[in-house]
């Protein structure tokens, strides 16, 4: 009951060369504490030292990876110290090259449906970690499947809700050095769609344009969306614009596509700034076709 609470800020996954703050909270409010590392390489700066409130550790090296506990000063205990805290595992990233992270069938996931996150690498990683940005809990640990070309893991996530949506990265590690991780994969934004009514999408001057002509796509709704997202079928990225309140009471964003050379099917979505990974239903698709060009789509 007198165990203090150890936490790591901004999180337990730390890039090599960066710093991490270890904070030891005593429930009674005793400010002094000691730190110990249970496994891996020793960290000399911890030994025979008393810290106050928190300890800024770094620049972090692979030697800092491992399990930490703290004891807070405790005048009423026979030893003068509390029982050891909960363990905190510090994982150091950047030790191996980054894996790749993909979403199947794609990163826009209907509310209530399931998405498969696939992390793969040409390095033979026995373990993968999946981490969502802004979450301080330990990342999800997954067992990799080894094959001749490297390794991979598939993680089925769902049913999709705004709580699961966010920016994901994955890391790889090898069995004998479990807390020394690869560099992070490129970030993957998983978005839950279908939470709000669909906006309308229209084209000015119209959906059929001459090659090289300017076209503007307007996304609008009576919902109080802060942001609109425009996506083109078969393209990974999306354009993003802030919504503006129009005289007619709609919230609108105009996407100038500039001189167009190729058409395509466009959709737009609305979202709120407070929940950037939660989007509306998609607008009805708007086919933009380009004349005077050998390729219409």
């Amino acid at each position: 009951q007198d165990k203090p609470f150890l936490s790591a800020w901004p999180g337990t996954v730390v890039s090599e060369g960066q710093h991490v703050t270890l904070q030891c909270r005593s429930r009674l409010g005793f400010n002094e504490f000691s730190l110990s590392k249970e496994d891996g390489m020793p960290v000399p700066e911890l030994y025979n030292r008393i810290f106050r409130n928190s300890f800024l550790m770094g620049p972090v090296t692979p030697a800092h990876a491992g399990t930490y506990r703290c004891c807070s000063s405790h005048p009423h205990s026979p030893t003068g110290w509390s029982a050891p805290s909960n363990p905190v595992v510090i994982m150091v990233t950047g030790v191996h090259r980054k894996p790749s992270l993909l979403a199947h069938p794609g990163p826009l996931v209907k509310s209530g449906e399931t998405v498969i996150l696939q992390c793969w690498s040409d390095v033979r990683f026995e373990r993968f970690l999946l981490h969502r940005e802004g979450i301080t809990e330990d990342p999800l640990r997954l067992v990799g499947q080894l094959h001749d070309a490297g390794s991979q893991v598939n993680y089925s996530m769902g049913p999709m809700t705004p709580a699961l949506a966010g920016t994901y990265r994955c890391f790889g590690s090898v069995t004998h050095l479990p807390y020394e991780l690869s560099a992070p994969s490129d970030p993957l934004d998983i978005v839950v769609v279908g939470l709000y009514g669909k906006p309308s999408l229209s084209a000015q001057p119209g959906p059929t344009v001459q090659a090289g002509e300017n076209v503007t796509l307007s996304c609008s709704s009576r919902s109080l969306f802060d942001i609109y997202h425009l996506s083109r079928e078969a393209e990974a990225g999306e354009l993003r614009l802030t919504a503006v309140l129009r005289v007619n009471g709609t919230f609108q964003a105009n996407f100038p596509l500039g001189p167009v050379t190729h058409g395509g099917n466009y959709r737009c979505f609305g979202s709120f700034r407070a929940l950037p990974h939660a989007w509306s239903d998609p607008s009805d698709p708007l086919p933009v076709s380009v004349t005077g060009n050998s390729r219409h789509l």
């Epitope: 904070q23 909270r25 009674l28 400010n31 928190s54």
Partner: antibody, heavy 119, light 107 residues
Framework: EVQLQQSGPELVKPGASVKISCKTS????????MHWVKQSHGKSLEWIGG????????NYNQKFKGKATLTVDTSSSIAYMELRSLTSEDSAVYYC????????????WGQGTLVTVSA | SIVMTQTPKFLLVSAGDRVTITCKAS??????VAWYQQKPGQSPKLLIY???NRYTGVPDRFTGSGYGTDFTFTISTVQAEDLAVYFC?????????FGSGTKLEIK
């Protein structure tokens, strides 16, 4: 349901002492830290100190050392705070407040006890 | 001890308004900041802990943010029952200290 029921208002003379109580129910008394907080009239809040009912361990705000003494009676699940050598500066509402295990020091509050020091 | 400087002291707003209160710590408190609401004649009630986490049962119109020394508490759409004094408090280092309070009044 967690409840912290504090003793009634006290009118005391300067130089005297007062002991106020915080009767708890709805949880295991010895598993949570009990803190005490002072609120002078129209002013902010000041942490006085905390006590661990499990072992009687205490931690005081230096400002209140010698002024406040925190104790518990585990058999009746009551926390006490005694204030001594009272002056008009000690006139205030005093709250007991329980922690939530580790996240927050003041998760549940008693209704407060008004102590008035007057000749 | 750590000083928590809270601003403004008073806020006069209409129902439906958005309200922001700020708290500045005299040194870094990481994210160890809580926010409390004290309605007239009542004891304080915990709203936000760890700077941005809503406590159990607290409506989602109440939000908090910040890290280090600068913290913000927001009521997205003020309601009549939000009439109260709001306090920030640092949980980082004892003695635990509170801001001076912001009195929210509804027009």
């Amino acid at each position: 349901e967690v409840q912290l029921q504090q003793s009634g208002p006290e009118l005391v003379k300067p130089g005297a002492s007062v002991k106020i109580s915080c009767k708890t129910s709805g949880y295991t008394f010895t598993e949570y830290i009990m803190h005490w907080v002072k609120q002078s009239h129209g002013k902010s809040l000041e942490w006085i100190g905390g006590i661990n009912p499990n072992n009687g361990g205490t931690n005081y705000n230096q400002k209140f050392k010698g002024k406040a003494t925190l104790t518990v009676d585990t058999s009746s699940s009551i926390a006490y705070m005694e204030l001594r050598s009272l002056t008009s500066e000690d006139s205030a509402v005093y709250y007991c407040a329980r922690d939530d295990g580790y996240y927050v020091k003041f998760a549940y509050w008693g209704q407060g006890t008004l102590v008035t020091v007057s000749a | 001890s750590i000083v928590m400087t809270q601003t403004p002291k008073f806020l006069l707003v209409s129902a439906g308004d958005r309200v922001t209160i700020t708290c500045k710590a005299s040194q870094s408190v990481i994210n160890d900041v809580a926010w409390y609401q004290q309605k007239p004649g009542q004891s304080p009630k915990l709203l936000i802990y760890y700077a941005s986490n809503r406590y159990t049962g607290v409506p989602d119109r109440f939000t908090g943010s910040g890290y280090g020394t600068d913290f913000t508490f927001t009521i997205s759409t003020v309601q009549a029952e939000d009439l109260a004094v709001y306090f920030c408090q640092q949980d980082y280092s004892s003695p635990f200290t509170f801001g001076s309070g912001t009195k929210l009044e509804i027009k």
